[in-house]
């Protein structure tokens, strides 16, 4: 069995450099002079003057001693007698203080101190010499140990290679004893033959005690750089990996802590462990129940997996994700939860591991620890959740997690808020249950508050706005959410985000949110009063000019500005204006900004979605006679007639509606011809009675699943504005955190067509629109 001292070393392995030196002093029973422990070496003085080095003397203590010591009275004879005793024994007291080992056993020396707990003045004066004596003794012992080991090592090396396993066992015990003392430990690690013999013995023995002693020796050597190198050069890593299969706990513990030290501090160790099949062995050990053992094992996995795709795949193939998630569900030991969350964080950037962690219940398991007092654990869980969140939009049982995330939006820690907003953005994307849940737990108010508090911190505002955009469409609580943004004073700050210093990704998300908010008639006036319309038009003009400039320069490829295509901005702004134009006062403002020429020009766009929103906004504006005339005057009839034949039924339907409204004041025969044209165009595939079809709503569903941010994705954007410091265990720079991001363009519906007023009889029952090609609204870009 491993001794208590042996097993205590497991704790040290977590921070070997700091603890090793101290622990070896402790193991040798060296006396503590107070230098190492800082233990006080002074006591209150009987003189009543206190300690001259102490500023603050406890006078009550001094007075107490006076009263205690001298409450009885002495005769002159007694005083003289005591003085005589003290004078006679002065030399012995000095010797007792400085050289206690020279005293005869049982000899009684009267003390000058009444309280035995307090040292006398002589004892206090003797302390430096005692410390010096201990130092000299230690030095002599060290030299003796070194000499002894130097002489013993060649013979012990031979015995470790002996055929007689009994001799080998005894030699292993002796070497282990030597490895516990610093001087002899250094002698061992300086003998390559000895280290090789230890390694060979460890992996070849069938004897439990031999295995324990050799593994223990290597563990003791692993606290020193020289020892690590010696183990590495002697082929110790494959041998230690082999020992991970040992049924003996103490052997297992020694092996894993030694490997941990090698992985942390020895160059080349990671590759050697991987080649020796260490990853598979370590994953298999995750079903053990010793939390300290698991903490070291998971940290080894993190070191091996970090930045190494092959290792991540081996962990996956060995069943790592499920085992790691089980740990997060089962244990409460903070260090273990932290190291496990670090492994999951590293794995959560791997596209193969991501779904496996989610399937194993990783989201829910990580969510359990978001209210833990350990900030480092919470932060790791949040990073991991954010990385996983774009692959978890179809997960069930997320109620608890969503509730906690909404709470965390109120945190004072910027990193926590940033992550919580990002996760909520992803989890509310194309998942109506999650949207409803977030709304029910006060998510709208929390997100609005978050945006208000965030100011111009776009790493918070962008995901928060995206989450609000998702929550304000396509679920039963969407209308409530649209109202709630206004009721919680969110409209001014939302419109403000359309202005500098906002960057394009945030502007794009905000435009989408405004479009959804405009679905609620109660928001029309406030949005207008906040100046949303002129800004949307300004952004539209700018983005359109940008696309035109590139087209005129012969560019066919859509270009990205800050990860956003300008065509997306054109489409988004036009779409928002389209919905805002349902309000008569808004239509006047839109028309007053001289937008009709631009909308007409957009009908010529090669992008169907832009054609559709342009036709849509013109359809709304055409309700007003003057606008209809202005549209016709801009030459819209030709492109609109062309669009009647579009494969996209949304485009064709809007084009028909605009043309119909433009014909309001035309002669009857013109209307008749137009009606025939519209009928033949719109029902070219499946002619049917006007009154047999459903209403005109175009409910275009979600386009696709959210995509995690990837380095090769042109729209890749990191959540992080800066790097993070290194973690305590292993190296942990930022790179691994830049994983599945939130999705700025997610979750856009296309709303029903506008009420066509008196043209309704003609338009009733037009075929429902197809639900394809809605990239800007429905996909996660």
């Amino acid at each position: 069995m491993a001794t208590q001292a042996d097993l205590m070393e497991l704790d040290m392995a977590m921070e070997p450099d700091r603890k090793a030196a101290v622990s070896h002093w402790q193991q040798q029973s060296y006396l503590d002079s107070g230098i190492h422990s800082g233990a006080t070496t002074t006591a209150p003085s009987l003189s009543g003057k206190g300690n001259p080095e102490e500023e603050d003397v406890d006078t009550s203590q001094v007075l107490y001693e006076w009263e205690q010591g001298f409450s009885q009275s002495f005769t002159q004879e007694q005083v003289a007698d005591i003085d005589g005793q003290y004078a006679m024994t002065r030399a012995q007291r000095v010797r007792a203080a400085m050289f206690p080992e020279t005293l005869d056993e049982g000899m009684q020396i009267p003390s000058t101190q009444f309280d035995a707990a307090h040292p006398t003045n002589v004892q206090r004066l003797a302390e430096p010499s005692q410390m010096l004596k201990h130092a000299v003794v230690n030095l002599i012992n060290y030299q003796d140990d070194a000499e002894l080991a130097t002489r013993a090592i060649p013979e012990l090396t031979k015995l470790l290679n002996d055929e007689d396993q009994v001799v080998v066992n005894k030699a292993a015990v002796m070497v282990h004893q030597l490895s516990k003392k610093e001087a002899s430990r250094h002698a061992i690690m300086r003998s390559p033959q000895m280290v090789s013999a230890i390694v060979r013995t460890m992996q070849n023995t069938n004897d439990v005690e031999t295995a324990r002693c050799t593994a223990g020796t290597l563990h003791n050597l692993s606290h020193h750089r020289e020892g690590l190198l010696a183990i590495f050069k002697s082929g110790g890593i494959p041998a230690l990996v082999k020992m991970l299969g040992s049924p003996v706990d103490s052997v297992l513990f020694y092996a894993i802590t030694t490997l941990h030290n090698l992985l942390l501090h020895q160059e080349g160790a990671k590759m050697a462990v991987r080649l020796a099949g260490g990853l598979q062995k370590m994953v298999a050990l995750l079903n053990k129940t010793n939390v300290k053992f698991l903490a070291i094992t998971t940290d080894c996995l993190q070191i091996l997996a970090y930045g190494n795709q092959e290792s991540k795949l081996i962990i996956l193939a060995s069943g790592g994700p499920q085992a790691l998630v089980n740990i997060m569900r089962t244990y409460t030991y903070e260090k273990l939860l932290w190291t496990t969350s670090r492994v999951l964080k590293v794995l959560s950037v791997c596209s193969s591991n991501k779904p496996a962690i989610v399937e194993a219940g990783g989201m829910q398991a990580l969510g359990l620890h978001l209210t833990d007092p350990s900030q480092r654990l919470v932060q790791n869980c949040l990073w991991t959740l954010r990385n996983l969140s774009d692959a978890a939009t179809k997960q069930e049982g997320m109620e608890g997690l969503l509730g906690t995330l909404v709470q965390l939006l109120g945190s004072d820690d910027i990193n926590v808020v940033t992550c919580a907003a990002g996760i909520l953005s992803n989890l509310t994307c194309n998942n109506y249950k999650n949207k409803m849940m977030v709304c029910q737990v006060g998510g709208i108010e929390a997100l609005v508050r978050t945006v208000l508090r965030a100011g111009d911190r776009e790493d918070i505002t962008e995901p928060a706005i995206c989450a609000l955009r998702h929550l304000t469409s396509r679920h039963q609580e969407a209308e409530m959410a649209q109202n709630a943004v206004r009721l919680h004073y969110g409209l001014p700050v939302v419109v403000k985000l359309l202005h500098p210093p906002s960057h394009w990704p945030l502007i794009k998300a905000t435009v989408g949110l405004i479009r959804n908010l405009a679905l609620c008639p109660a928001n029309h006036a406030p949005l207008r009063e906040q100046g949303a319309i002129p800004r949307l038009v300004q952004l539209l003009v700018r983005a359109h000019q940008d696309t035109q400039r590139r087209t005129s320069m012969g560019g066919t490829q859509q270009q990205f500005v800050e990860g956003v295509r300008m065509e997306e901005i054109v489409e988004g702004c036009t779409g928002a204006l389209h919905i805002l134009a349902r309000d008569v006062h808004n239509r006047i403002v839109i028309r007053g900004l001289n937008t009709i020429p631009l909308f007409v020009q957009l009908l010529y766009s090669p992008i169907e979605n832009i054609q559709r929103v342009a036709a849509g906004v013109l359809c709304e504006l055409a309700q007003d006679k003057e606008a209809a005339e202005a549209i016709e005057a801009e030459g819209a009839t030709a492109p609109l007639t062309e669009l009647l034949h579009s494969r996209n039924e949304g485009v064709a339907t809007y084009a028909a509606a605009v043309l119909f409204r433009m014909s309001e004041d035309k002669p009857q025969d013109y209307k008749k011809r137009l009606s025939v044209e519209l009928t033949s165009s719109l029902f070219r595939t499946e002619p049917m009675a006007w009154n047999e079809t459903a209403d005109l709503g175009l409910d275009i569903g979600a386009q696709g699943e959210p995509l995690g941010y990837r380095q090769d994705d042109p729209s890749y954007r990191s959540f992080h504005s800066g790097g993070y410091g290194q973690d305590a265990l292993g190296m942990d720079p930022m790179m691994e955190h830049e994983m599945g991001g939130h999705h700025p363009g997610a979750d856009y519906p296309v709303d029903g067509l506008p009420d066509l007023g008196h043209a309704q009889d003609l338009m009733d029952g037009l075929p429902p629109g197809d639900s394809n090609q809605l990239a800007w609204f429905d996909t996660d870009l």
Partner: nanobody, 118 residues
């Protein structure tokens, strides 16, 4: 240095028995192993059997079940009872004492010849 003296070797027919003894002279500290090794004609010296001062015995696979090792700590002797001898058991049998001190010391006897032949 401890002196080791072996005795009991000789010629024996296959299937026969022999008892080897080894006596150690001098002071022997505890934590030691006394054992027997042998060297066949044209072969390397190989381990046969050993016993610790706490009576923990160990045997080579080739002799397990046929040979028995025992020791008398008071007399500092070790005995090897060899039964069912085979021709391949032929060789010089050496007594070895390993004292596990810092540094360890190994002492060898002069050896005694055992011949198994019909």
């Amino acid at each position: 240095q401890v002196q080791l003296v072996e005795s009991g070797g000789g010629l024996v027919q296959p299937g026969g028995s022999l008892r080897l003894s080894c006596a150690a002279s001098g002071t022997i500290s505890s934590n030691n192993v006394m054992g027997w090794y042998r060297q066949g004609p044209g072969k390397q010296r190989e381990f046969v059997a050993s016993v610790t001062d706490s009576d923990l015995a160990n045997y080579a696979a080739s002799v397990k079940g046929r040979f028995t090792i025992s020791r008398d700590n008071a007399k500092n002797t070790v005995n090897l009872q060899m039964n069912s001898l085979r021709p391949e058991d032929t060789g010089v049998y050496y007594c070895r004492l390993t004292i596990m001190t810092y540094p360890p010391t190994i002492s060898w006897g002069q050896g005694t010849q055992v011949t198994v032949s019909s």
